[in-house]
């Protein structure tokens, strides 16, 4: 059975940022700004055809 | 530090797991200058199909 879509789980550390409780709350400015930067970054990295998007962004302490 | 976890979606057959990781790793320097994000410890794996079917992209 094929959906025509491949999914990849990706994890990485951002070593120059500090985790705090606002990254557990999607309504905070800190969460939304980081999510926006990361989403924009991935659109830059995979700008060649085939990239459909990203989902399920989660932040946790390093 | 902050650990980021996410799911990426691609049209099937357009990229292999090695290139997902390689292209991301090659962008780390630009990520630091453009977004002020210092990225390390990158890990990529493919998501098994049953999970994939439940994960909307974008």
């Amino acid at each position: 059975l094929s959906t025509g879509v491949s999914f990849f789980f990706l994890s990485f550390h951002i070593s120059n940022l500090q985790f705090n409780s606002s990254l557990e709350d999607p309504s905070t400015d800190y969460y939304q700004e980081l999510q926006r930067d990361i989403s924009e970054m991935f659109l830059q990295i995979y700008k060649q055809g085939g990239f459909l998007g990203l989902s399920n962004i989660k932040f946790r302490p390093g | 530090s902050v650990v980021v976890q996410l799911t990426l979606a691609f049209r099937e057959g357009t990229i292999n797991v090695h290139d997902v990781e390689t292209q991301f790793n090659q962008y780390k320097t630009e990520a630091a200058s453009r977004y002020n994000l210092t990225i390390s410890d990158v890990s990529v794996s493919d998501v098994p199909f049953p999970f994939s079917a439940q994960s909307g992209a974008g």
């Epitope: 491949s6 060649q48 055809g49 085939g50 | 099937e12 057959g13 357009t14 990229i15 292999n16 797991v17 090695h18 390689t22 090659q26 493919d46």
Partner: antibody
Framework: QVQLVQSGAEVKKPGASVKVSCKAS????????MHWVRQAPGQRLEWMGY????????HYNQKFKDRVTITRDTSASTAYMELSSLRSEDTAVYYC?????????????WGQGTLVTVSS | DIQMTQSPSSLSASVGDRVTITCRAS??????LVWYQQKPGKVPKLLIY???TLTDGVPSRFSGSGSGTDFTLTISSLQPEDVATYYC?????????FGQGTKLEIK
């Protein structure tokens, strides 16, 4: 037409190094990844590593990581593979092989091969 | 590392026969599977990529199928010029491993 022309056969002593060249023509050298593959007598093909000539990014098979170096000279449209600390089991035909362009996961053109013989 | 195992290692068939070669990956490689043909003393030649896409200029008697871990190369009607060793290759993740080859001969 696309051509990959490799350097000639080499005979080396154990412990020595060998550097094989692969001159590309008929396409834009910097837009296609170049891989190196070897084949020992009667054995399967074995992938060694690659270089992206545009970015100079390299990736090696861990089996050869400490002994292989892949480089390129964009002005000469040539890729090189150097293997050091040679031993008898490195006796093989060494091929350069071009990977197809974006989202093309295959080797579409191969060099003619370079026989490297390691013998004391 | 993903191990690629082909079967059989060698086979002998008659002209006109239908020939099937299988390739099994030790892990899921999706459809990132390539088939090459290598004639004696020659350079490997690309036959099929993405498990089932035939390369330009390859006769239509060749076909590929499979996904995940199990793949098949089929020659629908064997011809004398098909005598060669056939290799499958994992192109999902590094190292991009090859099968041990299947040597095909004419009876």
């Amino acid at each position: 037409q696309v051509q990959l022309v490799q350097s000639g056969a080499e005979v080396k002593k154990p412990g020595a190094s060998v550097k094989v060249s692969c001159k590309a023509s008929g396409y834009t050298f910097t837009t296609y990844t170049m891989h190196w593959v070897r084949q020992a007598p009667g054995q399967r093909l074995e992938w060694m590593g690659y270089i992206n000539p545009g970015s100079d990014y390299t990736h090696y098979n861990q089996k050869f990581k400490d002994r292989v170096t892949i480089t390129r000279d964009t002005s000469a449209s040539t890729a090189y593979m150097e293997l050091s600390s040679l031993r008898s089991e490195d006796t093989a035909v060494y091929y350069c092989a071009r990977q197809g362009n974006y989202a093309a996961y295959y080797f579409d053109y191969w060099g003619q091969g370079t026989l490297v013989t390691v013998s004391s | 590392d993903i191990q690629m195992t082909q079967s059989p290692s060698s086979l002998s068939a008659s002209v006109g026969d239908r020939v099937t070669i299988t390739c099994r990956a030790s892990g899921n490689i999706h459809n990132f599977l390539v088939w090459y043909q290598q004639k004696p003393g020659k350079v490997p030649k690309l036959l099929i990529y993405n498990a089932k896409t035939l390369t330009d200029g390859v006769p239509s008697r060749f076909s590929g199928s499979g996904s995940g871990t199990d793949f098949t190369l089929t020659i629908s009607s064997l011809q004398p010029e098909d005598v060669a060793t056939y290799y499958c290759q994992n192109f999902w993740n590094v190292p991009f491993t090859f099968g041990q080859g299947t040597k095909l001969e004419i009876k």
